[in-house]
Interface confidence: medium
C-alpha cells in the first residue's frame, strides 16, 4: 500500500489508477477507516450521508473535503478500463496535526546547586499523533535519569477533538561550580516523520551556590561518629563569636531537653543514641546558627566504622557540660 499523510481539516484526493477519465466508469472504492465497520463500498453514483465525508469525483478519484482522525485507515480502488483490464490502487492514510509552538510554563528563575530543582514544565497543545517532548541544555539533549536529570511526562487527549496535549516537567540537580546561567529549551517532535521539531524560547535561570556556614563547627570524638556499644561519644561545638552564645543541641531535628552547653557527652552508647546531631548557637543580636550535622552510629565488634551512620530514636543518658 502507498502511504499517504494528510493534515487534519484539509482536503485529500486519492487517484483511482486505471480508471477511465470520464464516465461511464466501472470502479468501486472500498474504505476501512475509523468511520466504518469493516469495509465500506463507495461507487461513482454516490448519494447519502457519506457525500459529506468522501465522494467519488467524475474522474474516479476519491475526494475527502476535510480529513479527520476517523479517516485514518485503508482506501482501495478497483477499476476496469475500456479494454476490460483491472487495476487496483491501495492507500494507507494517516493524518496529522502540528501543534502550536510549545511553551515552558512555571519556569524557575533561580536554581540551587547540589539539590534537585524544578526547572519548568514544557507544554505542547493540539498534536496528532501525540509526538514527544524533549529537553535541551545549552542546545544538547538532556537524557532523563542521567546526571541528576529527571523528567515527569503526562499525555492528555481532548475528548472532542482527539488532539493531544503533552506536558513534561524537568527536574535537575545543578553541579557545584557549574555554569551559573544554563540555557534550557524544550522541543516537540511530531509522531509522523518528515516534519521538523518545534522548539520553545529558551530560559536562563541563575544557579545559586549555597555557601556553608563556617562559623559553627561541630567536632566529634571518636572521629566519624561510629562507636562500639557502651562506648562514649563527645561532641564539641566551636563558635568563634564573642561573647560566647548559648549552645543548644539537636538530635534528628528536635532540640534535646538539656541546659545550654558547648560540650555534649553521650556515655554508654546504646541504640537509642543513634541519630543525627547538630549544635545551635543562639545570639541575642541575630538569628540562630546551626552546625553541620554529624551522624552517630553503633558498630558491632568486627565491623568497620562508617563515616556516617543511621538515624535513630531519642537519647536517654545524655550529658551536657557547662
Amino acid at each position: 500500500a502507498q502511504n499517504i499523510t494528510a493534515r487534519i481539516g484539509e482536503p485529500l484526493v486519492l487517484k483511482c489508477k486505471g480508471a477511465p477519465k470520464k464516465p461511464p466508469q466501472r470502479l468501486e472504492w472500498k474504505l476501512n477507516t475509523g468511520r466504518t465497520e469493516a469495509w465500506k463500498v463507495l461507487s461513482p453514483q454516490g448519494g447519502g450521508p457519506w457525500d459529506s465525508v468522501a465522494r467519488v469525483l467524475p474522474n474516479g478519484s476519491l475526494f475527502l473535503p476535510a480529513v479527520g482522525i476517523q479517516d485514518e485507515g485503508i482506501f482501495r480502488c478497483q477499476a476496469m478500463n475500456r479494454n476490460g483490464k483491472e487495476t487496483k490502487s491501495n492507500y494507507r492514510v494517516r493524518v496529522y496535526q502540528i501543534p502550536g509552538k510549545p511553551e515552558i510554563v512555571d519556569s524557575a528563575s533561580e536554581l540551587t546547586a547540589g539539590v534537585p530543582n524544578k526547572v519548568g514544565t514544557c507544554v505542547s497543545e493540539g498534536s496528532y499523533p501525540a509526538g514527544t517532548l524533549s529537553w535541551h541544555l545549552d542546545g544538547k539533549p538532556l537524557v532523563p535519569n542521567e546526571k541528576g536529570v529527571s523528567v515527569k511526562e503526562q499525555t492528555r487527549r481532548h475528548p472532542e477533538t482527539g488532539l493531544f496535549t503533552l506536558q513534561s516537567e524537568l527536574m535537575v540537580t545543578p553541579a557545584r561550580g557549574g555554569d551559573p546561567r544554563p540555557t534550557f529549551s524544550c522541543s516537540f517532535s511530531p509522531g509522523l516523520p518528515r516534519h521538523r521539531a518545534l522548539r520553545t524560547a529558551p530560559i536562563q535561570p541563575r544557579v545559586w551556590e549555597p555557601v556553608p556556614l563556617e562559623e559553627v563547627q561541630l567536632v566529634v570524638e571518636p572521629e566519624g561518629g561510629a562507636v562500639a556499644p557502651g562506648g562514649t561519644v563527645t561532641l564539641t561545638c566551636e563558635v568563634p563569636a564573642q561573647p560566647s552564645p548559648q549552645i543548644h543541641w539537636m538530635k534528628d531535628g528536635v532540640p534535646l531537653p538539656l541546659p545550654p552547653s558547648p560540650v555534649l557527652i553521650l556515655p554508654e552508647i546504646g541504640p537509642q543514641d543513634q541519630g543525627t546531631y547538630s549544635c545551635v548557637a543562639t545570639h541575642s543580636s541575630h538569628g540562630p546558627q546551626e552546625s553541620r550535622a554529624v551522624s552517630i552510629s553503633i558498630i558491632e565488634p568486627g565491623e568497620e566504622g562508617p563515616t556516617a551512620g543511621s538515624v535513630g530514636g531519642s537519647g536517654l543518658g545524655t550529658l551536657a557540660l557547662a
Partner: nanobody, 116 residues
Framework: EVQLVESGGGLVQPGGSLRLSCAAS????????MGWYRQAPGKQLELVAL???????NYADFVRGRFTISRDTTKKTLYLQMNSLEPEDTAVYYC??????????WGQGTQVTVSS
C-alpha cells in the same frame, strides 16, 4: 545567600490568634523539610512543629490541636497558624530549614507575647 525572614509576631490576649510567616529566598523551597522552633526567656530552645518535604506535619504535644503548620511553595513561604494562645506561648519564634549538603538555616526570629 539563603535568607529566612519571619513576620507576624506581636502582642495578643490569651485565647487570641496569630499567623506567623517565614519567607525563604535564595533556594528551591518546595523540596526542603522546615520547622518552627521557639525560645522563651531563660528557657531552652524547643520544637513547635515540623513539615516534611512531602507536606506531612508533626507537632509538639503542647501545641497539638491549637497550632497548624503549612507551606505555600509558589510563594516560598512557611506559615504557623496559632489559635487559643496561652501566656506560656510567649517566646521568640524561629523558622528553620534544611538546604543543600546538610546545611541548616534559621530566621532572625519574631517575638510573640501573650498577655492580658
Amino acid at each position: 545567600e539563603v535568607q529566612l525572614v519571619e513576620s507576624g509576631g506581636g502582642l495578643v490576649q490569651p485565647g487570641g490568634s496569630l499567623r506567623l510567616s517565614c519567607a525563604a529566598s535564595g533556594t528551591i523551597f518546595s523540596l526542603n523539610p522546615m520547622g518552627w522552633y521557639r525560645q522563651a526567656p531563660g528557657k531552652q530552645l524547643e520544637l513547635v512543629a515540623l513539615i516534611s518535604d512531602s507536606g506531612t506535619a508533626n507537632y509538639a504535644d503542647f501545641v497539638r490541636g491549637r497550632f497548624t503548620i503549612s507551606r505555600d511553595t509558589t510563594k516560598k513561604t512557611l506559615y504557623l497558624q496559632m489559635n487559643s494562645l496561652e501566656p506560656e506561648d510567649t517566646a521568640v519564634y524561629y523558622c528553620r530549614s534544611t538546604f543543600a549538603a546538610g546545611n541548616f538555616y534559621w530566621g532572625q526570629g519574631t517575638q510573640v507575647t501573650v498577655s492580658s
